[in-house]
């Protein structure tokens, strides 16, 4: 069971300082941006991180949403990352959900975050280069100190 608490507006970056945004095709991508680029591309660069109470606490449970014309929420259904047109729900009557991730602070690096899927234990949000695009994917952690699954989260409130 997950119960919604508070939400905050955030900019999410990978460790190469590329900014996460949602493109016109609703794909979550990373791109080099100056601070003014980041502002100019809002709301596509501003993510709503909603925190949830967890009946079996396994970390800070969150959903990640974006509000362009409508609100879309990040999902990892079938281990495929996509934004689904939906509001983060007030309650989720299950112990796992494709839209709930555990936001974890990397020990020794308070400012570095990982997002582990609640549906797929050991799978994390990651940045992966595919041709010329830097995509947000779900990835099984397979090597120690994998930088691709680490992010910084800057609050915009």
């Amino acid at each position: 069971y997950f119960g919604k608490l508070e939400s905050k507006l955030s900019v999410i970056r990978n460790l190469n300082d590329q900014v996460l945004f949602i493109d016109q095709g609703n794909r979550p991508l990373f791109e080099d941006m100056t601070d003014s680029d980041c502002r100019d591309n809002a709301p596509r660069t501003i993510f709503i991180i909603s925190m949830y109470k967890d009946s079996q606490p396994r970390g800070m449970a969150v959903t990640i949403s974006v509000k362009c014309e409508k609100i879309s929420t990040l999902s990892c259904e079938n281990k495929i990352i996509s934004f689904k047109e939906m509001n983060p729900p007030d309650n989720i009557k299950d112990t796992k959900s494709d839209i709930i991730f555990f936001q974890r602070s990397v020990p020794g690096h308070d400012n570095k975050m990982q997002f582990e899927s609640s549906s797929y234990e050991g799978y994390f949000l990651a940045c992966e280069k595919e041709r010329d695009l830097f995509k947000l994917i779900l990835k099984k952690e397979d090597e120690l100190g994998d930088r691709s699954i680490m992010f910084t989260v800057q609050n915009e409130d």
């Epitope: 608490l5 555990f102 020990p107 308070d110």
Partner: antibody
Framework: EVQLVQSGAEVKKPGSSVKVSCKAS????????ISWVRQAPGQGLEWMGN????????YYAQKFQGRVTITADESTSTAYMELSSLRSEDTAVYYC????????????WGQGTLVTVSS | DIVLTQPPSVSGAPGQRVTISCSGS????????VNWYQQLPGTAPKLLIY???HRPSGVPDRFSGSKSGTSASLAITGLQSEDEADYYC???????????FGGGTKLTVL
């Protein structure tokens, strides 16, 4: 760098209660769990329970259920552990520990508070 | 009521490699992650290894963790005098909510 600073040593009589504080500085307090772990003289570590300040949720080890109360004050970034009906076996060093990665991965520890229960 | 079993003591000469074992069951280590803590004399414990084999920043790569079945182990290579300490394993339940520690192992550097 997060620092956890605990209150000073206590000497208590059997049957009484003790309340130990743990003040966090230099990091986010409310969204992480604060656990309490004790260590009797020359013995190992024993988890007592924890609190997630943002939600107020508390979880207690079965052994301490009904005897321990863990609270948190977000305004002062302080967590508290109160243990009642003290007995001599409760003589131990009590540690608070922060968990930012997972509620049971203790990545930052207080310096410890010695509680002595003696008549 | 110690659920995880560790040897009470291990020893090694400087520069040597030592391992500390931690034995559990399917209800803890067999299905869940293992963490290791180092406690230097007179100080609070310090997180050494988390999630079986991850090192927090600042922990030397001389320390490594592994897990197989219902047992886990901590390996320390290039033993140094400052490694003399008590070492505790801990396992946690991912879906429920409980944690258990081993009884601790005293490492002596000869």
């Amino acid at each position: 760098e997060v620092q956890l600073v605990q209150s000073g040593a206590e000497v208590k009589k059997p049957g009484s209660s003790v309340k130990v504080s743990c003040k966090a500085s230099g990091g986010t307090f409310k969204s992480y769990a604060i656990s309490w772990v004790r260590q009797a003289p020359g013995q190992g570590l024993e988890w007592m329970g924890n609190i997630i300040p943002m939600t107020g949720q508390t979880y207690y080890a079965q052994k301490f259920q009904g005897r321990v109360t863990i609270t948190a004050d977000e305004s002062t970034s302080t967590a508290y552990m109160e243990l009642s009906s003290l007995r001599s076996e409760d003589t131990a060093v009590y540690y608070c520990a922060r968990a930012a990665y997972h509620p049971l991965v203790f990545d930052n520890w207080g310096q410890g508070t010695l509680v002595t229960v003696s008549s | 009521d110690i659920v995880l079993t560790q040897p009470p003591s291990v020893s090694g000469a400087p520069g040597q490699r030592v391992t500390i074992s931690c034995s559990g069951s399917s209800s803890n280590i067999g299905n869940h992650y293992v963490n290791w803590y180092q406690q230097l004399p007179g100080t609070a414990p310090k997180l050494l290894i988390y999630r079986n084999n991850h090192r927090p920043s600042g922990v030397p790569d001389r320390f490594s963790g592994s897990k197989s079945g219902t047992s886990a182990s901590l390996a320390i290579t290039g033993l140094q005098s400052e490694d003399e300490a008590d070492y505790y394993c801990q396992s946690w339940d991912y879906s429920g909510f409980s944690t258990v520690f081993g009884g601790g192992t005293k490492l002596t550097v000869l």
